[in-house]
């Protein structure tokens, strides 16, 4: 699987999950998030050669098409597969609120 | 929606579904598919600016991150959202077989 266990331990050029730390205030301008200051959102990148973690029949077909027609602009793209939530603390006036934001952390990638 | 109804009628630079005809024999080397000869598989391409048909909270966050950090390599990617099946005819020896291949035709795209 193209997950953090594999991708963070290997120098993988093809589609894989990459570490990306986002600081809410500095990188997003989100001053309202009090905790955490930031988090590892991670991201997916790298080429998607034929059959590499193909998401659907279409991505398999497109991968093969791209292999046999290298000049073509159409090819699968490396995108998130498994995502995990992130719990944040913020304030509404003087009242603290805790919320779980879904699909915030990329744990693995796929070619789609 | 970034679907064929919209994308095929507009000159859209950003993420959209694009027409792509694939000939089974010529483009994939699949001699075993007898009908159809080929089909419009289509594909997704184009930049994913902030909030454009964002698939998850992560893609929204990544889009904003990319807007505020233009030099960053991390950005959402334009990939298939809705896919449709394709019915094909092939022969096993002298016996005709009809099969519905799932997720073969891209009907719309999203930023993921």
């Amino acid at each position: 699987a193209l997950d953090t266990n594999y991708c963070f331990r290997n120098l993988e050029e093809n589609c894989c999950v990459r570490p990306l730390y986002i600081d809410f205030r500095q990188d997003l301008g989100w001053k309202w998030v009090h905790e955490p200051k930031g988090y590892y959102a991670n991201f997916c990148s790298g080429p998607c050669p034929y059959l590499r973690s193909a998401d659907t029949t279409h991505s398999t077909v497109l991968g093969l098409y791209n292999t046999l027609n290298p000049e073509a602009s159409a090819s699968p793209c490396c995108v998130p597969q498994d995502l995990e939530p992130l719990t944040i603390l913020y304030y509404v006036g003087r009242t603290p609120k805790v919320e779980q934001l879904s699909n915030m952390v990329v744990k693995s990638c796929k070619c789609s | 929606a970034l679907d064929t109804n919209y994308c095929f009628r507009n000159l859209e630079e950003n993420c959209c579904v694009r027409p792509l005809y694939i000939d089974f024999r010529q483009d994939l080397g699949w001699k075993w598919v007898h009908e159809p000869k080929g089909y419009y598989a289509n594909f997704c391409s184009g930049p994913c600016p902030y909030l454009r048909s964002a698939d998850t909270t992560h893609s929204t966050v990544l889009g904003l991150y990319n807007t505020l950090n233009p030099e960053a390599s991390a950005s959402p990617c334009c990939v298939p959202q809705d896919l449709e099946p394709l019915t094909i005819l092939y022969y096993v020896g002298r016996t005709p077989k009809v099969e519905q291949l799932s997720n073969m035709v891209v009907k719309s795209c999203k930023c993921s």
Epitope: - | K31, T87, Y91, G93, R94, T95, P96, V98
Partner: antibody, heavy 119, light 111 residues
Framework: EVQLLESGGGLVQPGGSLRLSCAAS????????MSWVRQAPGKGLELVAD??????????YYSDSVKDRFTISRDDSKSTLYLQMNSLRAEDTAVYYC??????????WGQGTLVTVSS | DIQLTQSPSSLSASVGDRVTITCRAS??????????MHWYQHKPGKQPKLLIY???NLASGIPSRFSGSGSGTDFTLTISSLQPEDFATYYC?????????FGGGTKVEIK
Amino acid sequence: EVQLLESGGGLVQPGGSLRLSCAASGFDFNSYGMSWVRQAPGKGLELVADIVSKTYNYTTYYSDSVKDRFTISRDDSKSTLYLQMNSLRAEDTAVYYCTVAPGGSFDYWGQGTLVTVSS
Amino acid sequence: DIQLTQSPSSLSASVGDRVTITCRASQSVSISRFNLMHWYQHKPGKQPKLLIYRASNLASGIPSRFSGSGSGTDFTLTISSLQPEDFATYYCQHSRESPWTFGGGTKVEIK
């Protein structure tokens, strides 16, 4: 260009044998099913024998009229189709065509070879 | 085995005529939306030639005056404007199941 060249036809006495050959070129012979179709004088086309590719275990078919007398075979290394005809009868007199059916239709045909069974 | 019955068995026509040949199968030769019937032209001393495959698809190099239609058990070959070179015998053939069989043929003669 697809070419199918039959040979081996001729005059033979009833009860005799003949071996027809069909040399194929211009296509991937290994991948496709091959057949022998005949036309007897004043009659229509009849599928006599058929053999599919190695992928499908060289499965064969014979019409009832030739079963146990004719044997179809192929040599993929030589791109050649064969029809071994034994115990020939007068009613086997016909033009025999070699043909290739990539799918459900016989797309290409040889020029035919005449087999005459007569005493 | 699936039997194919062609009609008429022979016909006389003139150059420029519209000619229709039918082929009826003893059971359906269609599967899903695919119609597994094919048509051939056969001239004396020549090898048969594929005209139409899967009911309505024109084979490579065949003039557009030839067309095919039908589904299930009933199929038609049409020559929109008969030409001198079209006088021949025409056969239908199915590939719905093994064994594939041919129709008895329709001989198109000059009137």
